[in-house]
């Protein structure tokens, strides 16, 4: 499984942002895929769950992501990306997008860097 | 790293009421959820509460919810949970833990005796 | 609320061999968590959603399953692995534990 993101990513604080991850594996799409995003923040604390994709989306029951995510994916488009809505400023951190699709060999994750910003900033 | 300090044991009389402590260390104590597990000896784990220390809110088991509460003091990184109406029912090891992949770290718990 | 029913209770394993812990569910959950617990410590996370290894255990530990059936497997037991394991699901409030499996050496 390969796995592609952005890379980085800057959203306005309240507003809401698609976290894009994207994948290819040689094996078909099944019941057996599996997608798990984590959220590490910026002062490097543990890392933490924010969302799980197997059949069903499966939001987190605990912590600072619960009734602020949602899937946004689309396995059978190779889509495993997520929702994260009313952003807040210590929502600045790495997002990882992990994808298992048995039996094709796990890959490196892919990871996100958000930053949550006043107001965009604008390049020329 | 991080660390759960509790206090080793308390023992206290039937119909009492207790305060167990629970100090956090080693990050950042408002950015995980702080959560209460109960251990009886044979009985197995059962989930007492969460508390969000950004704001004091708190989920709790239904089963809990006239027995315990839980709040936190910010200034010191420490939460606690209150038992009320003590039993021996309420013997047991009380664990904090916080929630981030999992319940990922714990408390070395504490071990509560109702015993008049 | 969701009942987790872990087998066997008790279980012997001798160095080597393969190791299966089942965990089932009394309604469907999505996810299902695993730890290990030795005596006189604290319970330490083994395998978060599913099949997810934490941090330091050994790559001969997976974790599978889905709906109300979850497993935990050992390809090869070793010494260090003797312990009382739980199973514990959180798609559904509030968050449950299996009674665990202890493993002993044979």
């Known amino acids: 499984v390969e796995i592609y993101t952005s890379g980085a990513l800057e959203a306005v604080n309240g507003t809401d942002a698609r976290l894009k991850c994207t994948f290819s594996s040689f094996a078909p799409v099944g019941d057996a895929l599996t997608v798990t995003w984590n959220f590490r923040p910026l002062d490097g604390g543990p890392e933490q769950f924010v969302f799980y994709y197997h059949i069903d989306p499966f939001q987190p029951m605990s912590g600072r992501f619960k009734d602020r995510v949602s899937w946004d994916g689309n396995p059978e488009r190779y889509d495993a990306s997520i929702l994260l809505w009313k952003l807040q400023f210590d929502d600045n951190g790495t997002y990882t997008c992990q994808v298992k699709n048995p039996p094709d060999v796990d890959g490196l994750v892919g990871t996100i860097r958000l930053s949550v910003v006043h107001t965009v900033r604008f390049s020329e | 790293q991080v660390q759960l300090q509790q206090p080793g044991a308390e023992l206290v009389k039937p119909g009492a009421s207790v305060k167990l402590s629970c100090k956090a260390s080693?990050?950042?104590?408002?950015n995980y959820w702080m959560h209460w597990v109960k251990l009886r000896p044979g009985q197995g784990f059962e989930w007492?509460?969460?508390?969000?220390?950004?704001?004091?809110?708190?989920d709790y088991n239904e089963k809990f919810k006239r027995k315990a509460t839980l709040t936190v003091d910010k200034s010191s990184s420490t939460a606690y949970m209150q038992l009320s109406s003590l039993t021996s029912e309420d013997s047991a090891v009380y664990y904090c833990?916080?929630?981030?992949?999992?319940?990922?770290?714990w408390g070395q718990g504490t071990t509560l005796t109702v015993s008049s | 609320q969701i009942v987790l029913t872990q087998s066997p209770a008790l279980m012997s394993a001798s160095p080597g061999e393969r190791v299966t812990l089942t965990c089932s569910a009394s309604?469907?959950?999505?996810?299902m968590y695993w730890y290990q617990q030795k005596p006189g410590s604290s319970p330490k996370p083994w395998i978060y959603?599913?099949?997810n290894l934490a941090s330091g255990v050994p790559a001969r530990f997976s974790g599978s399953g889905s709906g109300t059936s979850y497993s935990l497997t050992i390809s090869s037991m070793e010494a260090e692995d003797a312990a009382t394991y739980y199973c514990?699901?959180?798609?559904?409030?509030?968050?449950?534990f299996g009674a665990g499996t202890k493993l002993e050496l044979k």
């Open positions: 833990t916080i929630y981030t992949t999992a319940l990922d770290y």
């Open positions: 080693g990050y950042t104590f408002t």
């Open positions: 007492i509460g969460e508390i969000n220390p950004t704001n004091g809110g708190t």
């Open positions: 309604s469907s959950v999505g996810y």
């Open positions: 959603v599913t099949s």
């Open positions: 514990q699901q959180w798609s559904s409030n509030p968050p449950t």
